[in-house]
Amino acid sequence: AFGISGVQKYTRALHDSSITGISPITEYLASLSTYNDQSITFALEDESYEIYVEDLKKDEKKDKVLLSYYESQHPSNESGDGVDGKMLMVTLSPTKDFWLHANNKEHSVELHKCEKPLPDQAFFVLHNMHSNCVSFECKTDPGVFIGVKDNHLALIKVDSSENLCTENILFKLSET
């Protein structure tokens, strides 16, 4: 499995990093599934959206998510990279005006309706193997990633005690 690289080495003040442009550098419509090929689906229930991790039936259509990619500058005192220290941050929107948010207090992932500019809780640092196998690290809580727990999305702390081959924080992106 793909491991998140040396998380303990780079627990860094992501919330000090700045999005370098108000507009995304690119956007990508994709379905999101877990490393074990379960689909991430979104259902409107009582005027709010619920997020599920489930096996789809054979011909069932996968839900799509709009991933918007933003460039973000490392805090220069952190990275040592100067102007070169760029990360990719993403926001994930399954439907108009709703975005995935990190609720760090509850260790949960929620869908919130909001207007731009989006709050920091809606931004995730992109880690990837290729563009079709990724992990999402909370901008507001370095070392914490979107993951799968009990058939739901949750926030999962990845630290040195784990061997960093954590399949439950890996997601696949596909066009189908």
Epitope: F2, G6, Y10, H130, L164
Partner: antibody, heavy 121, light 106 residues
């Protein structure tokens, strides 16, 4: 300023081995994916191998799988390409490159000057 | 595996001309495409990333566009220093270069 300096190229006989090194400076090496790309004389560019930040994941061009090994030493800011069972078709300038973004395998933002490997008897 | 096909192989144009280079992918690559410039005797240099984003320090006469399988690099007003070979490169699935387009001055 980002700098990548490749060494280790030279003339080698078919079937023999060679180890290329690339020393990096000017950026936080352990944050970035690193790559080897080659270019045969008068030909185009060909991606050869990739390694993620901590060296735990490596990827290879099919024609070099089982013969080449990419590795890195983050303490020494160095990425390596161990090339075994060399063939004449491996003759090329080998470039080391750095990823564009921390933690992501997108784009080659910076390149070294290249080191020439000639496989010939 | 994704194949990248560039056209033309060689392009000859006059200084000041608008020049268009094409790159076609064998599958949808979702704008995960770069353009690199390589001058004779030099290492390649990143010009454009994610289809249409200009790398820092690259002149604004260079621009990129495209989506799906079809991508374009445009030089709005060709300059003598633009003589080089241009490579497209996809990173949507694996890593693959096109074979290159050599740009010459007439």
């Amino acid at each position: 300023e980002v700098q990548l300096v490749e060494t280790g190229g030279g003339l080698v006989q078919p079937g023999r081995s060679l180890k290329l090194s690339c020393v990096a400076s000017g950026f936080t090496f352990s944050n970035y994916w690193m790559y080897w790309i080659r270019q045969a004389p008068g030909m185009g560019l060909e991606w050869v191998s990739s390694i993620n930040n901590d060296g735990g994941n490596t990827y290879y061009l099919d024609s070099v799988k089982g013969r080449f090994t990419i590795s890195r030493n983050n303490a020494e800011n160095t990425v390596y390409l161990q090339m075994n069972s060399l063939r004449s078709e491996d003759t090329a300038t080998y470039y080391c490159a750095k990823g564009h973004y921390s933690y992501s395998s997108y784009s080659f933002a910076n390149w070294g000057q290249g080191t020439l490997v000639t496989v010939s008897s | 595996d994704i194949q990248m096909t560039q056209s033309p192989s060689v392009l000859s144009a006059s200084v000041g001309d608008r020049v268009t280079l094409s790159c076609k992918a064998s599958h949808n690559i979702n704008k995960h495409l770069d353009w690199y410039q390589q001058k004779v005797g030099e290492a390649p240099k990143l010009l454009i990333y994610f289809t249409n984003n200009l790398q820092t320090g690259i002149p604004s006469r260079f621009s990129g566009s495209g989506s799906g399988t079809d991508y374009t690099l445009t030089i709005s007003s060709l300059q003598p220093e633009d003589v080089a070979t241009y490579f497209c490169f996809q990173y949507n699935s694996g890593w693959t270069f096109g074979q290159g387009t050599k740009v010459e001055i007439k």
